[in-house]
């Protein structure tokens, strides 16, 4: 289970507000740190081993999932055909 | 990798005793830890363990409401506490880490099948 | 509980293999000399082999079963070979009774 946590909000400038946010995930036993709906999120651990990246559904609603070559990240393809692209380290 | 386990010794029944683990070199705040036991005669016990960021812990069943894992990720130490001591507590104690790393702001379990460093073992002897 | 084969033996050269089924999630091998003394990780992660450990030994799963498996079996192999993973329900870890090699 993941929530967002505000670190801290800039509101000394009454017309615009600054917040730095982070995921605090808590995974289960079999689970570790991945990305569900471009968020963090916690993942079967066997999704990661065997580099099955998009069946941690990594990409936005809508959009399509295809495994780079060698299985090296993943790309989410918009609609109106952008690609964002993410390698895995 | 290095994982120096200290606290053994001869003990008596009833009993308590504290197991310290000092980690070095890795990122120890960012992997699970596990304590695991071998007593005379019989194989490897799973004791206890512990999540990367000490928010979860577990225990096996022979040790269940006797033990407390703990860990001081400043100081790059794991703790098992043990009351109640039995004689079949005897036998050495390792400390052992799980290989996965879990980034930043996540608190994250580890995994018997993922342990990729051990500590050289404590003895523990309970003996009146 | 897991099973795996109380002992194996071979004659130098020749490949074992040990398997170790029942658990869940992933499964690792610890080679142990002596009982009492040092453990060492020969294979972690179902397949991962520490940097340290000699390409010989490698693992493989399939289904719910992980074969540790050495290939050009040498004396200093002999040891006792304790298989880890979470246990079935996965709620705790668990071990193998072990698996005795024995290089004639």
């Known amino acids: 289970t993941c929530e967002i946590v505000t670190l801290d909000r800039d509101s000394s400038q009454p017309r615009r507000t600054i917040a730095r946010q982070t995921a605090r995930c808590a995974c289960r036993k079999g689970q570790i740190a991945g990305t569900t709906r471009a968020r963090p999120a916690c993942v079967d651990a066997r999704i990661i081993k065997t580099k099955q990246w998009c069946d941690m559904l990594p990409c936005l609603e809508g959009e399509g999932c295809d495994l780079l070559i060698n299985r090296s990240g993943w790309t989410c393809t918009q609609p109106g055909g952008r690609i964002k692209t993410t390698t895995v380290s | 990798v290095t994982l120096d386990e200290s606290g053994g010794g001869l003990q008596t029944p009833g009993g308590a005793l504290s197991l310290v683990c000092k980690a070095s070199g890795f990122t120890f705040s960012s992997h699970g830890m596990f304590w695991v036991r071998q007593t005379p005669g019989k194989g490897l016990e799973y004791v206890a363990e512990i999540t990367n960021d000490g928010s979860g812990t577990n225990y096996g069943s022979a040790v269940k409401g006797r033990a407390t894992i703990s860990r001081d990720n400043g100081q790059s130490t794991v703790r098992l506490q043990l009351n109640n001591l039995r004689a079949e507590d005897t036998g050495t104690y390792f400390c052992a880490r799980s290989t996965y790393e879990c980034p930043g702001g996540f608190s994250c379990w580890g995994d018997t099948g993922q342990i990729d460093a051990w500590g050289h073992g404590t003895e523990v002897i309970v003996s009146s | 509980a897991l099973t795996q084969p109380s002992s194996v033996s071979a004659n130098p050269g020749e490949t074992v293999k040990i398997t170790c089924s029942g658990g869940?999630?992933?499964y690792g091998w610890f080679q142990q000399k002596s009982p009492g003394s040092a453990l060492v990780t020969v294979i972690?992660?179902?397949?991962e082999r520490p940097s340290d450990i000699p390409s010989r030994f490698s693992g493989a799963l399939s289904g719910s079963t992980n074969t540790l498996t050495i290939t050009g079996v040498q004396a200093d192999d002999e040891a006792v070979y304790f298989c880890g993973t979470e246990d079935i329900s996965g709620t705790a870890g668990v071990f193998g009774a072990g698996t005795t090699l024995t290089v004639l």
């Open positions: 869940s999630y992933s």
């Open positions: 972690y992660w179902d397949d």
